[in-house]
């Protein structure tokens, strides 16, 4: 089949990094600068992506592969192939349409990207709060008070005055 195909279509012999040039009797011509072909048999070369401005070049474009970009410090990649760069926020914040905003009480974000997530509700697992949550950190759940038989652990259960998961601001 391959031999038949190449007899019928001279372009199928053009390797990656070249294109089948209709203007020159369908001979294989190298991709011009700033372009590439990642597969054989192509009739045109694709334009190389330019990693400019907020984008930085992670891998240069070659005649057979497109450039790959990442983001300048203070920004992180979003989308397939780092199609966009989104602003970093501090831990304890999330990015909104109005910019970086602190996590609401009862939520946290331990990364420079993404959204604030609710603190774990320890009581749902029958556990108690060992370490209170903050804007930057989730609560740490510990054994339930019932599991703490006298002398079985050195952990002091938290004062029961507060609702699980809450911490003073």
């Amino acid at each position: 089949f391959e031999r038949t195909r190449s007899l019928q279509d001279p372009c199928s012999n053009c390797p990656a990094g070249t294109f089948c040039d209709n203007n020159r009797n369908q001979i294989c011509s190298p991709c011009p600068p700033n372009s590439f072909s990642s597969a054989g048999g192509q009739r045109t070369c694709d334009i190389c992506r330019q990693c400019k401005g907020v984008f930085r070049t992670r891998k240069e474009c070659s005649s057979t592969s497109n450039a790959e970009c990442d983001c300048t410090p203070g920004f992180h990649c979003l989308g397939a192939g780092c199609s966009m760069c989104e602003q970093d926020c501090k831990q304890g914040q999330e990015l909104t349409k109005k910019g970086c905003k602190d996590c609401c009480f009862g939520t946290f974000n331990d990364q420079k990207r993404g959204i604030c997530r609710p603190w774990t509700n320890c009581s749902l697992d029958g556990k108690s709060v060992l370490v209170n949550g903050t804007k930057e950190r989730d609560v740490v759940c510990g054994p339930s008070p019932a599991d703490l038989s006298p002398g079985a652990s050195s952990v002091t259960p938290p004062a029961p005055a507060r609702e699980p998961g809450h911490s003073p601001q």
Epitope: K52, V54, C85
Partner: antibody, heavy 118, light 110 residues
Framework: QVQLQESGPGLVKPSETLSLTCTVS????????WSWIRQPPGKGLEWIGY???????NYNPSLKSRVTISVDTSKNQFSLKLSSVTAADTAVYYC????????????WGQGTTVTVSS | QSVLTQPPSASGTPGQRVTISCSGS????????VNWYQQFPGTAPKLLIY???QRPSGVPDRFSGSKSGTSASLAISGLQSEDEADYYC???????????FGGGTKLTVL
């Protein structure tokens, strides 16, 4: 189809601040660079600066000390402020959408004329 | 003084082929792609050629672009009276981390 519309005062006094807004309609502001370009009467095009939708900015070094470009994604707008203006800042001001992967200005506003005069 | 250098004027008769040159340096044309814009009097510029030789939809194939080294050129074949306009080359400049323009070429159809 994405359209851009510049708005702001057509007359600014010397030493004051020129303020223009570009409203993006028919598409999202996300994923692109947004530039301000100006053209003095009878002259060529001059890039003022750009802002990426997520806030990254860069300005023409010759204007950098006087320029601020900001973006409001919730309103689909971006803005230009040029301080301490002189008669040399009299020009038609264009806002543009710039493709972020191949960098070309594929959408232009109609332009707004700003005259600096007392 | 523009970063990219274009001839201030060019002319041709209907049906002729004219070319407009654009010269730069290693930090702009030499390492990046070139775009061309067409501007009629009193109107905003319009993208004519991008990435050296690509035409946006709606642009006639009479317009073509090319690049070699630190220079680029715009060719218009089968010149028509409606092609009379100003033409600007532009491209990214790595030292500026932003775009630069040529001074523009006024094309007259005689």
């Amino acid at each position: 189809q994405v359209q851009l519309q510049e708005s702001g005062p057509g007359l600014v006094k010397p030493s004051e601040t020129l303020s223009l807004t570009c409203t993006v309609s028919g598409g999202s502001i996300s994923g692109y660079y947004w530039s301000w370009i100006r053209q003095p009467p009878g002259k060529g095009l001059e890039w003022i600066g750009y802002i990426y939708y997520s806030g990254f900015t860069n300005y023409n070094p010759s204007l950098k000390s006087r320029v601020t470009i900001s973006v409001d994604t919730s309103k689909n707008q971006f803005s230009l402020k040029l301080s301490s203006v002189t008669a040399a800042d009299t020009a038609v001001y264009y806002c543009t959408r710039d493709h972020s992967h191949y960098y070309y200005m594929d959408v232009w506003g109609q332009g707004t004329t700003v005259t600096v005069s007392s | 003084q523009s970063v990219l250098t274009q001839p201030p004027s060019a002319s041709g008769t209907p049906g002729q082929r004219v070319t407009i040159s654009c010269s730069g340096s290693s930090s702009n044309i030499g390492s990046n792609t070139v775009n061309w814009y067409q501007q009629f009097p009193g109107t905003a510029p319009k993208l004519l050629i991008y990435s050296n030789n690509q035409r946006p939809s709606g642009v006639p194939d009479r317009f073509s672009g090319s690049k070699s080294g630190t220079s680029a050129s715009l060719a218009i074949s089968g010149l028509q009276s409606e092609d009379e306009a100003d033409y600007y080359c532009a491209g990214w400049d790595d030292s500026l981390n932003g775009p630069v323009f040529g001074g523009g070429t006024k094309l007259t159809v005689l």
